[in-house]
């Protein structure tokens, strides 16, 4: 299930005045598409161009991150007169052209979504042959990937003065809220660190001082679900053990 965000500002500004018989270069992409991790998403992209009945060689390209300079994630080429766009690049084999570039449609399907796919994507078409021309969406479509929480790391670490602290790192979108529970803790939100730069979906919570032996449980929760993991502290054994 894919939701396309309607940009109210765009709609407000989008009052058609006259229709124009001759097209010019333009690209239409929604501001945002949302889908869940593990699912597939469709990134719509249609275009108009000034070259009537163009039938020459063309290349369709999608890039990620930034316009013009971002890395390509998909590229295909269609020979003169052909409606088949032969895939030349599909990053990790997860990108597939849904649209027909000959019919001004570059829509792309992204399979097996991961949180790392949460980026802005830019479509581009290039004409070669009799006509040499190209156009790229400047604003792009933001792929918003949502995911239930997953605890990626839970550990007990030594602290100064023979003490111990516990760390719990989870990922999810929306970023999950983390809570620790354990001996003499009740439920504690315990020093949640903000998502780190470049790791926007990761959240870390620290228990700075473990005062009692026993089981400490980290719970990560967001609107899509929850996840738990535990560590065990046995100081009388002179060591700590972890179980997830």
């Amino acid at each position: 299930f894919v939701r396309t965000k309607i940009d109210t500002t765009e709609n407000l500004l989008n009052t058609e005045v006259h229709s124009s018989p001759a097209q010019r270069w333009s690209m239409q992409v929604p501001p945002e598409v949302s889908a869940e991790a593990g699912d597939a998403a469709v990134l719509p992209c249609t275009f108009t161009h000034p070259h009537r009945h163009y039938d020459g060689p063309l290349t369709a390209i999608w890039r990620a991150g930034e316009p013009y300079a971002g890395p390509q994630v998909f590229r295909c080429a269609a020979a003169r007169g052909s409606e088949l766009c032969q895939t030349a690049l599909s990053l990790h084999g997860r990108f597939r052209l849904l649209g027909n570039p000959r019919r001004n449609d570059l829509s792309l399907r992204v399979e097996r979504l991961a949180l790392a796919d949460d980026r802005r994507y830019f479509c581009r078409v290039e004409f070669a042959g009799d006509v040499h021309d190209r156009y790229e969406s400047r604003h792009g479509v933001r792929l918003h990937v949502t995911a239930a929480p997953r605890i990626v790391n839970i550990s007990v670490l030594p602290s100064p003065a023979h003490a111990f602290r516990a760390l719990c790192t989870a990922e999810g979108e929306p970023p999950p809220a983390l809570a620790w529970s354990g001996p003499a803790l009740g439920n504690s939100l315990a020093a949640v660190r903000s998502p780190r730069e470049g790791h926007g979906h990761l959240v870390t919570a620290e228990l700075p001082a473990l005062t009692h032996d026993g089981r400490y449980t980290c719970t990560a929760a967001n609107s899509l679900g929850r996840s738990e993991a535990s560590v065990y502290l046995f100081r009388f054994h002179g060591a700590s053990g972890a179980s997830t």
């Epitope: 765009e10 058609e16 006259h18 010019r24 190209r134 969406s137």
Partner: antibody
Framework: QLQLQESGPGLVKPSETLSLTCAVS???????WSWVRQPPGKGLEWIGE???????TYKPSLKSRVTISVDNSKNQLSLKLTSVTAADTAVYYC???????????WGRGTMVTVSS | SSELTQDPAVSVALGQTVRITCRGD??????ASWYQQKPRQAPQLVIY???NRASGIPDRFSGSISGNTASLTITGAQAEDEAAYFC???????????FGGGTKVTVL
């Protein structure tokens, strides 16, 4: 609501560097942003643009003298124009590109005079 | 010289129709946008892309494009429409933006 505010020295000496900033408030800086100038009594001249990712494009005749950058943490963009002459005297505007090549939000502009 | 050419000035009687033109080879490939600028004010977007009105712009303003010419038409001009009007688009290479020289509209 989105507002843009240009700021910088109103007077710059010839051969020096003109430095302006544009503060973006009321919205994310995730977009394309342009600097446009207007000499007194004349038309608009596009200087260049920057995407929030740092990609830039400059007017070819100014390219050797101009640098446009964006500071996402401060929600501002900046313009640097080196080796200025009297011909660079103008009102300088920053503007947001909301659709391909169309600017829907403009700052009020700041007047910069190049004179010794 | 600008890659987009506009007539320096036009006048129109109150309530009448005026058409402002913008010419340039790049307009065969790219859409034009139009801006209104009143004295001591920043420009304001009027028409963009495939002849779409910007937010808050009255429907007496309309746009069209044909060949290498983009046009802005004010049907039933009002006193408050007296201003300079600028067009902008891409250059012929598509690599950067250009503005027309502007047209001063006087409402008589």
């Amino acid at each position: 609501q989105l507002q843009l505010q240009e700021s910088g020295p109103g007077l710059v000496k010839p051969s020096e560097t003109l430095s302006l900033t544009c503060a973006v408030s009321g919205a994310s800086i995730s977009n394309w942003w342009s600097w446009v100038r207007q000499p007194p009594g004349k038309g608009l001249e596009w200087i260049g643009e920057v995407h929030h990712s740092g990609v830039t494009t400059y007017k070819p005749s100014l390219k050797s003298r101009v640098t446009i950058s964006v500071d996402n943490s401060k929600n501002q963009l900046s313009l640097k124009l080196t080796s200025v002459t009297a011909a660079d005297t103008a009102v300088y505007y920053c503007a947001r590109e909301f659709a391909d090549d169309a600017f829907d939000i403009w700052g009020r502009g700041t007047m910069v005079t190049v004179s010794s | 010289s600008s890659e987009l050419t506009q007539d320096p000035a036009v006048s129109v009687a109150l309530g009448q129709t005026v058409r402002i033109t913008c010419r340039g080879d790049s307009l065969r490939k790219y859409y034009a946008s139009w801006y209104q600028q009143k004295p001591r004010q920043a420009p304001q977007l009027v028409i963009y892309h495939k002849n779409n009105r910007a937010s808050g712009i009255p429907d007496r303003f309309s746009g069209s494009i044909s060949g290498n010419t983009a046009s802005l038409t004010i049907t039933g001009a009002q006193a408050e429409d007296e201003a300079a009007y600028f067009c902008n688009s891409r250059d012929t290479s598509g690599n950067y933006l250009v503005f027309g020289g502007g047209t001063k509209v006087t409402v008589l």
